[in-house]
């Protein structure tokens, strides 16, 4: 049966026993800045082009054992959530991956900047259709990272990022705090903000909306047919990147402002239990859970 | 995210160093009274001292970025410091990534075209 997260973002009219807008997002290219990925996993084979871009710090610890499946874990799962054949949101979207996170899931602001610059240069060399950039990472507030995101957004690129998993104000993190970026928090099957160990999803006025981010089934790098459940604001951001890809594929001329407005318009309103957030943040945090547009756009979104 | 917000720095640390008018023998000294600022991550364990993104003013051309980077290296060498230019930015932001001692920050902030310098820091999969 359909995984809970795909059901949650699907308009009621389409909730049959399977989620199948088969060509969703086919006009859009989604860039993923993350770990290395297992691009020939059955769930994503032929959908993800691994670019030659790699800018990662060395792994910490003298005895770190680099294991391919662990190195690829985070990125493979997210690629599957965006465009996977069976558990993906935008099954028609093509992706390009850049490696900016090492085998421990760690990267640098500078490496991310160089990755964003690489995307801009690729866009200039070979202009394609709409571009979505997924940044499933977070660091401390960074003026330069936010500035780079702003420049890329002004060049017509849609950037989607994780709000962060620190149970904290997203405005203290980057790229989550960049105003031009679509920042996504995580909710669970009960529409509760996601708790992750002692921490959880970030919140506050720098978050644009929430999306499913707990127990999300997706491609596992453990084997070429494996699936695994992962949780985090990265998974939530991947859902919104997929939804954005489908919206842009249906209406390629949408501006960032229009896309943001549509994402908000079609979101489920006031379903999140706000008691989870600190009292002073409740009024600032958007009570929105991302969803695809309903059947009025049948011809556009569900060809 | 969330358009329409005012700039929010949080606990973000900003060290402002006013530029001296006497410019260390530079031909192309900045206008008197302008300041370049230094930024670093508020979360200490995430800081990566020794690597810095030197961001230049918006209209700076690639050739000027390269020239500024070379100038920094030359001035650092005169003071007995080794530096390494790791990347020159162009296309999104003008500037360069440099590996150098933090002792050189004051010098770097006084270079022509410099808007601000940010110490590199870590980002993490979420």
């Amino acid at each position: 049966s359909i995984p809970w997260n795909l059901e949650r973002i699907t308009p009621p009219r389409y909730r049959a026993d399977e989620y199948q807008p088969p060509d969703g997002g086919s006009l859009v290219e989604v860039y993923l800045l993350d770990t290395s990925i297992q691009s020939d996993h059955r769930e994503i084979e032929g959908r993800v082009m691994v670019t030659d871009f790699e800018n990662v710090p060395e792994e910490d610890g003298t005895r770190f054992h680099r294991q391919a499946s662990k190195c690829d874990s985070h990125g493979t799962h997210l690629a599957g959530v965006v465009s996977g054949r069976d558990a993906g949101v935008a099954k028609g979207a093509s992706m390009r991956s850049l490696r900016v996170l090492n085998c421990q899931g760690k990267g640098t602001v500078s490496g991310t900047l160089i990755g964003l610059e690489f995307i801009r240069k690729s866009q200039l060399v070979q202009p394609v259709g709409p571009l979505v950039v997924l940044l499933p990472l977070a660091g401390g507030y960074s003026r330069v990272l936010n500035a780079a995101c702003q420049r890329l957004a002004r060049a017509g690129v849609v950037l989607v990022t994780a709000a962060g998993n620190f149970r904290d104000d997203a405005c203290l993190y980057s790229p989550a705090s960049a105003p031009e970026v679509i920042t996504v928090g995580a909710t669970n099957a009960q529409d509760q903000p996601v708790t992750l160990g002692t921490l959880g999803t970030n919140f506050g006025r720098c978050v644009d909306l929430f999306a499913p981010g707990e127990d999300i089934i997706g491609a596992s790098s453990d084997c070429s047919t494996c699936f695994v459940s992962q949780s985090g604001t990265s998974q939530a951001a991947a859902h919104v990147a997929g939804i954005a890809a489908m919206m842009l594929s249906a209406e390629p001329e949408l501006t960032l402002a229009e896309l943001r407005q549509r994402l908000i318009h079609f979101s489920a309103k006031d379903v999140i239990n706000e008691a989870w957030f600190p009292e002073d943040q409740r009024v600032l945090t958007p009570n929105l859970v991302a969803a695809l547009p309903p059947s009025t756009h049948e011809n556009l979104y569900f060809q | 995210g969330a358009m329409g917000q005012e700039d929010e720095d949080g606990d973000y640390e900003e060290l402002v160093l006013a530029l001296r008018s006497e410019e260390d023998g530079l031909a192309e000294a900045p206008e008197h009274g302008t300041t370049a600022t230094f930024h670093r991550c508020a979360k200490d364990p995430w800081r990566l001292p020794g690597t810095y993104v030197v961001v230049l003013k918006e209209e700076t051309h690639l050739s000027q970025s390269e020239r500024t980077a070379r100038r920094l290296q030359a001035q650092a060498a005169r003071r007995g410091y080794l530096t390494k230019i790791l990347h020159v930015f162009h296309g999104l932001l003008p500037g360069f990534l440099v590996k150098m001692s933090g002792d050189l920050l004051e010098l770097a902030l006084k270079l022509p075209h410099v808007d601000y310098i940010e110490e590199d820091s870590s980002v993490f999969a979420q």
């Epitope: 020939d40 084979e45 082009m49 099954k91 | -």
Partner: antibody, heavy 115, light 109 residues
Framework: QVQLVQSGAEVKRPGASVKVSCKAS????????ISWVRQAPGQGLEWMGW????????NYAQKVQGRVTMTTDTSTSTVYMELRSLSSDDTAVYYC????????WGQGTTVTVSS | QSALTQPASVSGSPGQSITISCTGT?????????VSWYQQHPGKPPKLMIY???NRPSGVSIRFSGSKSGNTASLTISGLQAEDEADYFC?????????FGGGTKLTVL
């Protein structure tokens, strides 16, 4: 254009081994693995397994597990399928195909097992 | 014994439409969006005609279409032509592998 080119026909004795090659070109090799499928005379298609060109991981069908080994040589963009302890039941045309989606196929390699 | 069940043969006259069924279980056809259909002429390798239930690769005639309901997938060929005479195989993912149907011989009368 995307192409998979296989090695030539083989005749083998029962108990012997055969190694079939498949050279890939015209696409980003690491974006797809290679599947191997065989077809006995007058019969249907049987999936034998898959190998990752990206990291060499394999996924073998239960029926041939223990007798089959798939390998890759990334320097020549070639994938190999070796089948051991051959019997007359292994007489078939062996195909390589691109990925699990099998959207592009090699021309086939006829393997005859006969005493 | 093939994992997926197809009729051994179907036939139709030129210009007619025919449908070939492919029945599996919830562990294969019913559980995945990845049902494919292949056409195979004698002495030739199979050719992909439909992938992911209903998608056509470029270069494949729009006369070929695919669908799925529950555990059964179907291939429909409209406006039959003489060159459509061939064997047709369906395939599906399973949790760890791939399975094919036994094949259907299409005869154009």
């Amino acid at each position: 254009q995307v192409q998979l080119v296989q090695s030539g026909a083989e005749v083998k004795r029962p108990g012997a081994s055969v190694k079939v090659s498949c050279k890939a070109s015209g696409y980003t090799l690491t974006s797809y693995g290679i599947s191997w499928v065989r077809q006995a005379p007058g019969q249907g298609l049987e999936w034998m397994g898959w190998i990752s060109v990206y990291n060499g991981n394999t996924n073998y069908a239960q029926k041939v597990q223990g007798r089959v080994t798939m390998t890759t040589d990334t320097s020549t963009s070639t994938v190999y399928m070796e089948l051991r302890s051959l019997s007359s039941d292994d007489t078939a045309v062996y195909y390589c195909a691109r990925g699990y989606g099998m959207d592009v196929w090699g021309q086939g390699t006829t393997v005859t097992v006969s005493s | 014994q093939s994992a997926l069940t197809q009729p051994a043969s179907v036939s139709g006259s030129p210009g007619q439409s025919i449908t070939i069924s492919c029945t599996g279980t919830s562990s294969d056809v019913g559980g995945y969006n990845s049902v494919s259909w292949y056409q195979q002429h004698p002495g030739k390798p199979p050719k992909l005609m439909i992938y992911e239930v209903s998608n056509r690769p470029s270069g494949v005639s729009i006369r070929f279409s695919g669908s799925k309901s529950g555990n059964t997938a179907s291939l429909t060929i409209s406006g039959l032509q003489a060159e459509d005479e061939a064997d047709y195989f369906c395939s599906s993912y399973t949790s760890t592998s791939m399975v094919f149907g036994g094949g259907t011989k299409l005869t154009v009368l």
